[in-house]
Interface confidence: medium
C-alpha cells in the first residue's frame, strides 16, 4: 500500500534513548532499535520504557503500521489478552478509553498509536521482565497483536524492543527471514547499549516531546492497514503479574461492551475510569473504524461503580471507517 504523504514507515515517535547519548550518536542506535522492535512484525510496533524519573513507572507505546481502520486497541500484560494476559486498557476510537490499575493514563497519540503509563508503586506495579502486549483490531479485515518487554537490566529511560516471538501470526513477508544485516544491527545495538551502561551515567533528561502532547507528524508511523489481521505477538514468561488484578473489581462493565462484536475484544474484568479521549486529527492515515463506534457524541452509560466519564471539551469525535482484524 502507499500513502499520499509518506512518513517514516517503521519509526515509533519519540526516541527513548535521547538524553542518554548525544544526538548524533543517538541516530544509529535508534534506527537499529526501531528495526529490532519491528523486525518480523511490521504491522505493529511496541515500545516499553522505564521512566527515568520514576524507576518503577513504565510507559508502553504501541502503533499500527497497517492500512486500515482501527476498531479497538487492547493493552494487556503477562502475555496476549486471550492467552493468560490481563487487560490493562482498552481504547476505542469512538467510545473512549477504559483502564485498570496499575494503568495510570492511556491515551491516543495518533490515529494509529497509543501510549499507556503504568503506576510504579503498590502490589500491582510491573517489574522489568513483564510482557506487555498490544492488539489492534480492524473490521472486517483481521487483527494484529505484538508484545514487548523491558530487559531486567535495562537502564531507566531506555526503551527496549520486544523479545523475539515464539508465536507469530501474520501474513507478513519477512517474518521468518530476518536478514543478517538486521541481526547484526540488533547485536550491535545491544553492544552499544551495554557500552553505554558501563559509562558513568549522565544526567538523564526528559525527552523533548511531552507525553501529553500529540507527537509531531514527522514521527508518526505510516498507517495503512485497514485489512483486519491478527497482530503477531511474542510471549514471555513473567512472574510479576499481580494476583490481585483479577479480583480488584466486580465483573461486568459498561453496556457498550455488550454491543461490540465478539471479535472486537475480550470483555475487561470490570469497570474503571473511562476517558473519552479523541484521536488527534493530525495523526496519520490509518482510519479509525466507523463500525464499532457509537453515534457521534454518544456517551457510554454510567453503569457501574467507579465508572466516571470525562466529557470531551472538543466535542464529538469524528467517526471513521472499519475493516476488520480479528
Amino acid at each position: 500500500m502507499r500513502t499520499e504523504a509518506q512518513v517514516p514507515a517503521l519509526q515509533p515517535p519519540e526516541p527513548g534513548l535521547e538524553g542518554a547519548m548525544g544526538h548524533r550518536t543517538l541516530v544509529l542506535p535508534w534506527v537499529l532499535l526501531t528495526l529490532c522492535v519491528t523486525a518480523g512484525t511490521p504491522e505493529v510496533w511496541v515500545q516499553v520504557r522505564m521512566e527515568a524519573t520514576e524507576l518503577s513507572s513504565f510507559t508502553i507505546r504501541c502503533g499500527f503500521l497497517g492500512s486500515g481502520s482501527i476498531s479497538l486497541v487492547t493493552v494487556s500484560w503477562g502475555g496476549p489478552n486471550g492467552a493468560g494476559g490481563t487487560t490493562l486498557a482498552v481504547l476505542h476510537p469512538e467510545r473512549g478509553i477504559r483502564q485498570w490499575a496499575p494503568a495510570r493514563q492511556a491515551r491516543w497519540e495518533t490515529q494509529s498509536s497509543i501510549s499507556l503509563i503504568l503506576e510504579g508503586s503498590g502490589a500491582s506495579s510491573p517489574c522489568a521482565n513483564t510482557t506487555f502486549c498490544c492488539k489492534f483490531a480492524s473490521f472486517p479485515e483481521g487483527s494484529w497483536e505484538a508484545c514487548g518487554s523491558l530487559p531486567p537490566s535495562s537502564d531507566p529511560g531506555l526503551s527496549a524492543p520486544p523479545t523475539p516471538a515464539p508465536i507469530l501470526r501474520a501474513d507478513l513477508a519477512g517474518i521468518l527471514g530476518v536478514s543478517g544485516v538486521l541481526l547484526f544491527g540488533c547485536v550491535y545495538l545491544l553492544h552499544l547499549l551495554r557500552r553505554h551502561k558501563h559509562r558513568p551515567a549522565p544526567r538523564l533528561q526528559p525527552s523533548r516531546t511531552s507525553p501529553q502532547a500529540p507527537r509531531a507528524r514527522a514521527w508518526a508511523p505510516s498507517q495503512a492497514s485497514q485489512a483486519a489481521l491478527h497482530v503477531p505477538y511474542a510471549t514471555i514468561n513473567t512472574s510479576c503479574r499481580p494476583a490481585t488484578l483479577d479480583t480488584a473489581h466486580p465483573h461486568g462493565g459498561p453496556s457498550w461492551w455488550a454491543s461490540l462484536p465478539t471479535h472486537a475484544a475480550h470483555r475487561p474484568q470490570g469497570p474503571a475510569a473511562w476517558a473519552s479521549t479523541p484521536i488527534p486529527a493530525r495523526g496519520s492515515f490509518v482510519s479509525v473504524e466507523n463500525g464499532l463506534y457509537a453515534q457521534a457524541g454518544e456517551r457510554p452509560p454510567h453503569t457501574g461503580p467507579g465508572l466516571t466519564l470525562f466529557p470531551d471539551p472538543r466535542g464529538p469525535r469524528a467517526m471513521e471507517g472499519p475493516l476488520g482484524v480479528r
Epitope: 473490521f139 501474513d171 471507517g321
Partner: antibody, heavy 115, light 111 residues
Framework: DVQLQESGPGLVKPSQSLSLTCSVT?????????WNWIRQFPGNNLEWMGY???????NYNPSLRNRISITRDTSKNQFFLKLNSVTTEDTATYYC????????WGQGTTLTVSS | QLILTQSSSASFSLGASAKLTCTLS???????IEWYQQQPLKAPKYVME???????RTGDGIPDRFSGSSSGADRYLSISNIQPEDEAIYIC?????????FGGGTKVTVL
Amino acid sequence: DVQLQESGPGLVKPSQSLSLTCSVTGYSITSNYYWNWIRQFPGNNLEWMGYISSDGTNNYNPSLRNRISITRDTSKNQFFLKLNSVTTEDTATYYCARGLRYGPWGQGTTLTVSS
Amino acid sequence: QLILTQSSSASFSLGASAKLTCTLSSQHSTYTIEWYQQQPLKAPKYVMEVKNDGSHRTGDGIPDRFSGSSSGADRYLSISNIQPEDEAIYICGVGDINNYIFGGGTKVTVL
C-alpha cells in the same frame, strides 16, 4: 500467491438451504484475517454477509443473522456459507474474500434460486 | 441508518478527468469510506480509503492517476487522464458497528 475459489450448486429451490464452499490456496485460514462472504445482486448491489475469523469466531450481517452460518474445515483449508430458507431474492453472485481491502476476492459463483 | 448514495452512471472522454461522488447519510458524515473498482466480469478490487479530512490511501497496484478527497458528507474518487481500462463500476463501502455497507455503484464509461 493466495487464491480463493468459490463453488456451489448453481441452482437452489426456494425454501431450501444453499451451501457454498470457498477453497483457499497459498495461505492458511487459521493464520490470520477474517474470511468473508459477500454477494452481488443482479442490479450490481453488493452485500457483506459475514465472516469467520482465523480463530473460528463469526460475525454476521444483522439482516441475515437468523439464517446464515459460516463454518470452516481447517484440514481442507476451506470455509463455507450456509444460508437457510432461501428465496428468489437470494439469487446473486457470491464472493468469498480474505478481508475486504487487502483481498484477494474469489472470482465469484452465480447462484440462482428458482423453482 | 447508514446509507451511501452514488449516481448510477457517468461518461467521460478518453484522457479527461473524472470525479465520482459517494455521499454518506448526514449523521455519518465523518466516516471514512472505501472505494472499490469492479471491471466487467471480475470481482471487486480495493482502490482506496478516503477519510473525513480528505486524506486518502490507495491500494496495491492502483495507478497514481487515482486520488481521493472529501467535502462534508461527500467522498470523492478522482481519476485523471482516464484510460479505457478504467471503465468499470466504482462502488463505495463503509463499516458501521458490526456491519459493512456498500453504495449502489457508479458505472463509468470511457468514450
